[in-house]
Amino acid sequence: APPCLDGSPCANGGRCTQLPSREAACLCPPGWVGERCQLEDPCHSGPCAGRGVCQSSVVAGTARFSCRCPRGFRGPDCSLPDPCLSSPCAHGARCSVGPDGRFLCSCPPGYQGRSCRSDVDECRVGEPCRHGGTCLNTPGSFRCQCPAGYTGPLCENPAVPCAPSPCRNGGTCRQSGDLTYDCACLPGFEGQNCEVNVDDCPGHRCLNGGTCVDGVNTYNCQCPPEWTGQFCTEDVDECQLQPNACHNGGTCFNTLGGHSCVCVNGWTGESCSQNIDDCATAVCFHGATCHDRVASFYCACPMGKTGLLCHLDDACVSNPCHEDAICDTNPVNGRAICTCPPGFTGGACDQDVDECSIGANPCEHLGRCVNTQGSFLCQCGRGYTGPRCETDVNECLSGPCRNQATCLDRIGQFTCICMAGFTGTYCE
C-alpha cells in the first residue's frame, strides 16, 4: 500500500507526497523542518540581525541555523561589525578576522607589521647579492648592482655582453671584449644601443611651404593644400577637385600654387561663397526696409509709399477707385490703376456700363433688357425664365392634366392628351 495512505507520517500539518521512488516525503508548513516536520525551524524566529540571510539545516536530528552576513558584518547572527571593511591591510595584503574579532593581515613578500605597511629591508637580512654585488633596498623588494662580469637579479650569472642583446631597433650585437660589445645599427638609427632615431629632416627637400616629418631612415613632406607630391613640387589643380573649389556657379581657373574664381553676378569672395550685399549700395527711400537678394535688392515700402525705391507717394491711399474696384499703383509714376468689377468702367470705375446698349441684346428669346447700376435685368416673355430668359418654362411640371392624361409642354403653354372617355383642357 502507498506509504501516504497508512496514516499521515507528517507532523505539525505537513502534507504527505509520494516521490517517484514510491517513498513518502513531507512538505512542511512555515515554522517547521525535518523529515516529518517534527522540528521547529530555527530561522522562523529571525535570528540573523540586519540584512543577514538565515539558512536552516538538520544535522543528526537537530535543527540548526547559519547566517549569511551582508558586507561589513560578521558573527553567528551577523551582529558583529567586520574589521576588514575599512581595508586596513596595505600593499595588497589579504585581510581575515582573528579569534578575538580583530583583523589579521597576511603580508606579501617585502612587507611586515600588523597592517603590512612596514618595508622589510632585505639588505639587512643576510647578503642576498652574490659575487660582491651591492644590495639596494626598494619598497617591498631589493635590487642588486652587479660588479663587472656578473649579471642576473642576484648577480649570480657570469655576464655575456650580447646575451641578451642590448641593441635596440633591430641592431646587431657583436662582442668586442670579455665584457664589451658593439651594436651595428640598422639605417636610420644611432647611439650605443641603436636607441636614437636619426633626424632625417636636416637638409630636407620639402618645397613650397611643405613641412618635414621625420621617419625611420627617411622623411615625409606635409604639403600645404595647394601643393602635392613627395617634395610638394606638384601643383594641385584645385579645379579638378570635388566639391568644386568655386561655389554658386563660379568659374574655376587653376594657377601655379593656387586657383582663382570668377564669380557670377551677385557673389564675391575667394570661392564665390559671399552674397554681395546689394543693400549696401541700394537707395531705398527713408522709412523703407532694404532686403538683399542675389544680384538685386528689394525695398519694402512703408504705408503710403510705392515704387521700386519707395520714392513715390502711393495714390491708392486716398481710395481713388470706386468701391469693389481693385487699386494698384504704377511703380514708375505712382499713379493709381483701378481694376473695375463687372458692370463698371472709367478711370475710377465709377461709370455704369449699359449692358443693354453694347452689342447684341443679352436677354434671350426676345426678353426685354433693363439696365441697372452695375448690372442689368431681363424681363422675359411668356414661357421663359432665368437671368437671361434662357430657360423654357415647363408648364407640365405642376401636373395640370387629370385622369391619367399625358401632358405635352409647349412654349408658354401645355396640351393634355386625354385617355379614352375623357375630354376638356385638363381632361377633367
Epitope: 618645397l207 607630391g229 613627395q230 606638384e234 594657377t255 601655379l256
Partner: antibody
Framework: EVQLLESGGGLVQPGGSLRLSCAAS????????MSWVRQAPGKGLEWVSY????????YYPDSVKGRFTISRDNSKNTLYLQMNSLRAEDTAVYYC?????????????WGQGTMVTVSS | DVVMTQTPLSLSVTPGQPASISCRSS???????????LHWYLQKPGQSPQLLIY???NRFSGVPDRFSGSGSGTDFTLKISRVEAEDVGVYFC?????????FGQGTKVEIK
C-alpha cells in the same frame, strides 16, 4: 594672328637692372597665364618666372627668386619682367611664353626673344 | 630639381629615314592627380621654340603626323617616322609635373 613681341633687352653691368616687356596681340591676353623662359648662348632653355591671368599669383625658381619680378597690365596687353642685381650668368635670350591651359602648363605660343647681356 | 637627360645630343639623318630621341627624367613625371606632363619642343635655326607634343603623346595643332610621342614614368621617346629637310633644329623635352619646370639639354637634328 596670335603674336608675342619682346623688347627691353640690351647690355647692362653686373648689379644693374633692366625691365623687359612682352606685347601680346591676336588673342584675349587676360585669359592666359604667362611665363618668361631664357636661353643662355649655345645652351638649353630655363624657365624663370610665371604669372597667373589676373596677376594675383606668381612663381620664381630659386635661381632668380628675390631678384626678378614678373607683372602684367591686362589693359595694355603687356607682360613685364623687372630684373635687378643682374649677374653674368643672367646673360641670355629671354622669351615670353603663353600657357595654353592652366592644367598642363606647356607653352603653345612663344615670342621671338630679346637678348640681355650682363657684362662689365 | 628634376633633371631631364636627352640622348643622343646630336643626330644626322637621311631624308625619308626615321629618327628617335630619348628623354629620361630623374623623378617620375606622373602627377599625383594622374596626368603625365612631358612635352616636346622644336627650335628651328634662328627661331624661337615651338610646341610639337604635349602630355607625352598629344600632337599640337598643325604638327605633321610623322611626329609621335610615347613613354611613361621616367622614360620618354620622340619619333619622326620619315625625316624631312624642314625638321632640322634642336629638339627639347620638358616637364611641368614638378616645379621648377625644367627642360632637357636638347638634341640637334641635321640632314645628311
Amino acid at each position: 594672328e596670335v603674336q608675342l613681341l619682346e623688347s627691353g633687352g640690351g647690355l647692362v653691368q653686373p648689379g644693374g637692372s633692366l625691365r623687359l616687356s612682352c606685347a601680346a596681340s591676336g588673342f584675349t591676353f587676360s585669359n592666359y597665364d604667362m611665363s618668361w623662359v631664357r636661353q643662355a648662348p649655345g645652351k638649353g632653355l630655363e624657365w624663370v618666372s610665371y604669372i597667373s591671368r589676373g596677376g594675383g599669383s606668381t612663381y620664381y625658381p630659386d635661381s632668380v627668386k628675390g631678384r626678378f619680378t614678373i607683372s602684367r597690365d591686362n589693359s595694355k596687353n603687356t607682360l613685364y619682367l623687372q630684373m635687378n642685381s643682374l649677374r653674368a650668368e643672367d646673360t641670355a635670350v629671354y622669351y615670353c611664353g603663353r600657357h595654353a591651359t592652366t592644367a598642363y602648363w606647356y607653352f603653345d605660343v612663344w615670342g621671338q626673344g630679346t637678348m640681355v647681356t650682363v657684362s662689365s | 630639381d628634376v633633371v631631364m637627360t636627352q640622348t643622343p645630343l646630336s643626330l644626322s639623318v637621311t631624308p625619308g629615314q626615321p629618327a628617335s630621341i630619348s628623354c629620361r627624367s630623374s623623378q617620375s613625371l606622373v602627377h599625383t592627380q594622374g596626368n603625365t606632363y612631358l612635352h616636346w619642343y622644336l627650335q628651328k635655326p634662328g627661331q624661337s621654340p615651338q610646341l610639337l607634343i604635349y602630355k607625352v603623346s598629344n600632337r599640337f595643332s598643325g604638327v605633321p603626323d610623322r611626329f609621335s610621342g610615347s613613354g611613361s614614368g621616367t622614360d620618354f621617346t620622340l619619333k619622326i617616322s620619315r625625316v624631312e629637310a624642314e625638321d632640322v633644329g634642336v629638339y627639347f623635352c620638358s616637364q611641368s609635373t614638378h616645379v621648377p619646370w625644367t627642360f632637357g639639354q636638347g638634341t640637334k637634328v641635321e640632314i645628311k
